[in-house]
Amino acid sequence: SRLRQEDFPPRIVEHPSDVIVSKGEPTTLNCKAEGRPTPTIEWYKDGERVETDKDDPRSHRMLLPSGSLFFLRIVHGRRSKPDEGSYVCVARNYLGEAVSRNASLEVALLRDDFRQNPTDVVVAAGEPAILECQPPRGHPEPTIYWKKDKVRIDDKEERISIRGGKLMISNTRKSDAGMYTCVGTNMVGERDSDPAELTVFERPTFLRRPINQVVLEEEAVEFRCQVQGDPQPTVRWKKDDADLPRGRYDIKDDYTLRIKKTMSTDEGTYMCIAENRVGKMEASATLTVRAPPQFVVRPRDQIVAQGRTVTFPCETKGNPQPAVFWQKEGSQNLLFPNQPQQPNSRCSVSPTGDLTITNIQRSDAGYYICQALTVAGSILAKAQLEVTDVLTDRPPPIILQGPANQTLAVDGTALLKCKATGDPLPVISWLKEGFTFPGRDPRATIQEQGTLQIKNLRISDTGTYTCVATSSSGETSWSAVLDVTESGATISKNYDLSDLPGPPSKPQVTDVTKNSVTLSWQPGTPGTLPASAYIIEAFSQSVSNSWQTVANHVKTTLYTVRGLRPNTIYLFMVRAINPQGLSDPSPMSDPVRTQDISPPAQGVDHRQVQKELGDVLVRLHNPVVLTPTTVQVTWTVDRQPQFIQGYRVMYRQTSGLQATSSWQNLDAKVPTERSAVLVNLKKGVTYEIKVRPYFNEFQGMDSESKTVRTTEEAPSA
């Protein structure tokens, strides 16, 4: 056909525009062309022809009569993206074709999964909080906003800023706590992140801090420490930067630190440490424990010959360390440690508080008072100095080695040793069963050293033999049992001194009361055999003219001899025991006078004694029948007070002829004693027993009573 004059080639009068559209949404790419004849329109994407409903009725793309390309829904997957690309429309007629400008079709996208979900944040109030979020991938690039507890946050508040996915709260408050959600948004829609919790905690703060305290020893003390914070802080205590030692301290529910009975070792700095997840605070206070003065070593009465030197010890302790000074009773003159000695003075006080008087004169006799003084109190102790011309109270003879119990054979030879010393030198004689021995029996002789020898032994020689050492200063005896049998040894074992322990050192007096003396000593010199126990012997001119054994089976090297007379001078010596026998005696102690009964014991508060005794709780155990006539009584004590001299075991018959007879007493005179044996009881009788603590004339509460029935015969094994 030929060209018509009015025909003209196509020209695009409406070009398609770039478009961003959400997946699944409809959209149109516009294209309008003019031309005669009316041009046909075709669309190309990325250079390839686009199929429309004209090609496939099932296509989701439709070519509209106007030439526009209409998409029923934009198809766009993770990988296949058939609708995205660069489009042109081409208008054609027989005169030519016109191509539109490129129009890009981009698919808006907003994925579900956030590149970075905000995470839980814990901050301390006042600190900044930052919540970070990267929205899901999307096109156009999503913007974000934040919601707190599902309500959009207004970032106009000056504390809050949102920058590049970060929510920043500059100065957090408790009210900022909550659930925060980051919302990513673009034209596709919105996506909520997983919520993140902002927790605003509060650092520990002190409502009440511990305060410095000064207390007396044995008083209770409390350090308070009240804290607040969120979460509730844990509270712990330290002493001098170290953990509290176990057992001494109570920590109450409100974190108060309590010490029931303070000791000087409790002094120091106590720190209360409050800690929670967001902080730690410390507050400290010092404890000063004032210990009233106490005597470590009291001065004791001394008897000293003229011209000699005497030292009265007076060692004290306390906090602060007590100031010690001395004065003679009746004198205004005070003597202090480290005082420059006066030209004619014979008295001086050592730095530790000991008073020394040199070149003793008769006028020095009297009472000397040691006083110890601190802000926490004062104490004093008196000691008497007696001055003699010479020490007239010479002790009776001392038997160094006495006879030993032995079993010998008929026709054998017995050697009963007896070696004595003294001033003047004693004479040794022997008794058998209390009668002079050997008489005229030619088989028995007393040898030069005092040993009794008996030859050709007979069974009738069996008995108790006593060696008696006599001098003008008194007499001392020592007994042993000789048992003559058919099967014994033929001759006495001659105990060598090397088989026996060495003699202990001279006993030192460490404490004196009206009825007791506390002695301490050292074991025998190294190289000698060890002792398994000790015995203590005492002598007093006013009590008897011989040495008395006042303690047996003593296991320690410190012992209190009880049951002594008041205001009486005593001498003591100690022997060591091992299975082979007894050692030589120790050197004699210095003379020691027990306290007088009349003045009350210095430094003892009677109300305190009575109070402490009242607090003692004695728990009596079930008595144990040892033999038909002996019962062992044992007890325990809940609190061992300072003032206790011993325990009175009280017992009475509650069956038989003398039922509910009066109480009989047995005193256990050692404060540490926890058992006693009742002897000479009646067989097959019920006894009621109780125990009572005592100190001087003061008595504590009785234990509960227990009953026990003695057996008719010895208990079977």
Epitope: K23, K45, D46, E48, R49, V50, E51, D55, D56, I74, V75, H76, G77, R78, R79, S80, K81, P82, D83, G85, D112, D113
Partner: antibody, heavy 118, light 105 residues
């Protein structure tokens, strides 16, 4: 009509290679990813990988890496799958499948039986 | 790789029965899950995409549900032409489940 037509059955010896073709028609070939899936006798479906016809990018699961090659010829709208070093357990029906914009395999080829036997 | 576990591996049912097949992903795949039907000697056919969207031309007795890790294909009233093997597929990593064979009781 949108369809995928695959090449015919093959019998191969162990150690040999096989190349299966898949001719696409009725749609814009470069607009949709092409996948290959195989099914051994009596077994389930096993995905072997994809090719983006627009740029030739490919991705394979670990199992097939180094042994499978996927190519395309946009001028004839055909995709190819080449499997080398054949073993008897490679005996299977091999399918090509188009991935729609909805991330699903909406159009499948009829399948190509490959038998590996000595 | 995300593993897909399908259950049961086979089931017997009668025409008119309601049939449920489940598919579990080893980790969350949001809604990226498809269901296919395959009859012996034929290529698989897409039934459901994006967990619950019905492919055009598929009868409405087929429905899908679930998101995250647990998904279900339900045939509300089994028809004779529905006896086949059904596969789930996650479209993140494109792996298939092991299949469920629906047989006539």
């Amino acid at each position: 009509e949108v369809q995928l037509v695959q090449s015919g059955a093959e019998v191969k010896k162990p150690g040999a290679s096989v190349k299966v073709s898949c001719k696409a028609s009725g749609y814009t070939f470069t607009g949709y990813y092409m996948h290959w899936v195989r099914q051994a006798p009596g077994q389930g479906l096993e995905w072997m990988g994809w090719i983006n016809p627009k740029n030739g990018d490919t991705e394979f699961p670990q199992k097939f890496q180094g042994r499978v090659t996927m190519t395309r010829d946009t001028s004839i709208t055909t995709a190819y799958m080449d499997l080398s070093r054949l073993r008897s357990d490679d005996t299977a029906v091999y399918y090509c499948a188009r991935e729609s914009g909805d991330d699903a395999f909406d159009i499948w080829g009829q399948g190509t039986m490959v038998t590996v036997s000595s | 790789d995300i593993q897909m576990t399908q259950s049961p591996s086979s089931l017997s049912a009668s025409v008119g029965d309601r049939v449920t097949i489940t598919c579990r992903a080893s980790q969350s795949i949001s809604s990226y899950l498809n269901w296919y039907q395959q009859k012996p000697g034929k290529a698989p056919k897409l039934l459901i995409y994006a967990a619950s969207s019905l492919q055009s031309g598929v009868p409405s007795r087929f429905s899908g549900s679930g998101s995250g890790t647990d998904f279900t294909l339900t045939i509300s009233s089994l028809q004779p032409e529905d006896f086949a093997t059904y596969y789930c597929q996650q479209s993140v990593g494109l792996f298939f489940g092991g299949g469920t064979k629906v047989e006539i009781k």
